[in-house]
C-alpha cells in the first residue's frame, strides 16, 4: 500500500550534469543545458516528485511526473520507460507499482540518488546513450557503483 504525501518540483541531472527533460514526443532525454536553458525549457525540465508513505518501508517511495499541457507520470511497465498521461494517484493498493520508484541516496553521498523500480527488484532508472540521444531507461544493474544509475535532484521550490 502506498499513500501520497507531499510533492516537490525538481530538476534531475545525470552525473555528467546533463538535464533530464521531456521532449515533444514525450520521451525522457538528457541534454547539456545552461541554467538559463533549463529555465527557458520549463516546464519540460521541471519534474514533480511526489512522495508516498509505504506500508513496508523500503526507502523513499516516489512518483516522477511532469506537467506540460497535461500531467504525465513516469512508468516502467514491462520494463519500458515511458510517460503515461495520468496524475499520480493518492493511494496505490499494492506493494508494487510501475509508477513507484524507491529514491535512495548512494551510500556516503547524500547528493547522489538512485531510483529503483518497485515492480522490478534490481532494476534502476539509468541514463544510456543510444546513437546521438541520451535516454532515460530502466536497467537491470548489479554494478551499483555504475555512474549511469546515479542522479542529482535539485529542488526548485
Amino acid at each position: 500500500y502506498f499513500g501520497k504525501l507531499e510533492s516537490k518540483l525538481s530538476v534531475i541531472r545525470n552525473l555528467n550534469d546533463q538535464v533530464l527533460f521531456i521532449d515533444q514526443g514525450n520521451r525522457p532525454l538528457f541534454e547539456d543545458m545552461t541554467d538559463s536553458d533549463c529555465r527557458d525549457n520549463a516546464p519540460r525540465t521541471i519534474f514533480i516528485i511526489s512522495m508516498y508513505k509505504d506500508s513496508q518501508p523500503r526507502g523513499m517511495a516516489v512518483t516522477i511526473s511532469v506537467k506540460c499541457e497535461k500531467i504525465s507520470t513516469l512508468s516502467c511497465e514491462n520494463k519500458i520507460i515511458s510517460f503515461k498521461e495520468m496524475n499520480p494517484p493518492d493511494n496505490i493498493k499494492d506493494t508494487k507499482s510501475d509508477i513507484i520508484f524507491f529514491q535512495r541516496s548512494v551510500p556516503g553521498h547524500d547528493n547522489k540518488m538512485q531510483f529503483e523500480s518497485s515492480s522490478y527488484e534490481g532494476y534502476f532508472l539509468a541514463c544510456e546513450k543510444e546513437r546521438d540521444l541520451f535516454k532515460l531507461i530502466l536497467k537491470k544493474e548489479d554494478e551499483l557503483g555504475d555512474r549511469s544509475i546515479m542522479f542529482t535532484v535539485q529542488n526548485e521550490d
Epitope: 526507502g59 524507491f102 551510500p107 537491470k140 548489479d142 554494478e143
Partner: antibody, heavy 126, light 107 residues
Framework: QVQLVQSGAEVKKPGASVKVSCKVS????????FHWVRQAPGKGLEWMGR????????KYAERFKDRVTMTEDTSTDTAYMELSSLRSEDTAVYYC???????????????????WGQGTLVTVSS | DIQMTQSPSSVSASVGDRVTITCLAS??????LTWYQQKPGKAPKLLIY???KLQDGVPSRFSGSGSGTDYTLTISSLQPEDFATYYC?????????FGQGTKLEIK
C-alpha cells in the same frame, strides 16, 4: 538454505579445456547471478566473471575473456564454467557463488556473494 | 580496474586480542564492500556486507567500518576459531576485485 554443489576434481593436460558445473539445491529467489572465483594453491581469491540466469548475459574479467565461457541451464538450476587453452598456472580451486541483493534497514541494496560451492580442484599437468 | 590494497598480509595475535585489518580502494566504492573469512580447504564465508552490516549468524565481535576508499574489519576479542584468512571484496564496479588477503595466525 541455498546450497551449491560443484562437480568433482579434474586433471587436464595443457591446451585442453575443462567444464565445471554448479548445481543449486534448496530454495533460491529470483534476481540472483552466478559468479565464478578461483584460487591458485596458496594464493588469494580471483574473480573470473558472472552470468545472469535471467538473460544469460555475462561479464568476464579481462584476463579470462578470450578463454572462459559461462553458461546456465535454468531447467536444472545449474551453472557451468568452461575454461579453454589450459596452462599450468590455471591449476586452482574454482568456486561458484551466488550474487544476490541484501538490503539495509532503509531498503538500500547491496550485492553479496552469499552461498558458495565447495570448490572444484582443477589440476593442469603434462 | 579498482585496486584493493589489503593490509597487513599477515598478523600474529593471541586469543582475546583486538585485531584490525584494512582495505584501501583505488577509488570511491560507495561502501559496496564485503568481508569474507576463509579457512584452509573451505570456501569463503560472508562476514560483513555494505562495509558495516553483520551477516546473520556472525558473532558480534566482528565489525566493519569505513566509506569512500578506506575500510576496516575489526575483531574485538579473538577467539580460537577466528584464526583464518580474511579477504575484502569491492562490489561497486566490474571487474570485481578482492584484497590480497590477511592471514591471521596464532602468536
Amino acid at each position: 538454505q541455498v546450497q551449491l554443489v560443484q562437480s568433482g576434481a579434474e586433471v587436464k593436460k595443457p591446451g585442453a579445456s575443462v567444464k565445471v558445473s554448479c548445481k543449486v539445491s534448496g530454495e533460491i529467489s529470483t534476481g540472483y547471478y552466478f559468479h565464478w572465483v578461483r584460487q591458485a594453491p596458496g594464493k588469494g581469491l580471483e574473480w573470473m566473471g558472472r552470468i545472469d540466469p535471467e538473460d544469460d548475459s555475462t561479464k568476464y574479467a579481462e584476463r579470462f575473456k578470450d578463454r572462459v565461457t559461462m553458461t546456465e541451464d535454468t531447467s536444472t538450476d545449474t551453472a557451468y564454467m568452461e575454461l579453454s587453452s589450459l596452462r599450468s598456472e590455471d591449476t586452482a580451486v574454482y568456486y561458484c557463488t551466488t550474487w544476490r541483493i541484501y538490503r539495509d534497514s532503509s531498503g538500500r541494496p547491496f550485492y553479496v556473494m552469499d552461498a558458495w560451492g565447495q570448490g572444484t580442484l582443477v589440476t593442469v599437468s603434462s | 580496474d579498482i585496486q584493493m590494497t589489503q593490509s597487513p598480509s599477515s598478523v600474529s595475535a593471541s586469543v582475546g586480542d583486538r585485531v584490525t585489518i584494512t582495505c584501501l580502494a583505488s577509488e570511491d566504492i560507495y561502501t559496496y564492500l564485503t568481508w569474507y573469512q576463509q579457512k584452509p580447504g573451505k570456501a569463503p564465508k560472508l562476514l560483513i556486507y555494505g562495509a558495516n552490516k553483520l551477516q546473520d549468524g556472525v558473532p558480534s565481535r566482528f565489525s566493519g567500518s569505513g566509506s569512500g576508499t578506506d575500510y576496516t574489519l575489526t575483531i574485538s576479542s579473538l577467539q580460537p576459531e577466528d584464526f583464518a584468512t580474511y579477504y575484502c571484496l569491492q562490489g561497486s564496479k566490474f571487474p570485481l576485485t578482492f584484497g590480497q588477503g590477511t592471514k591471521l595466525e596464532i602468536k
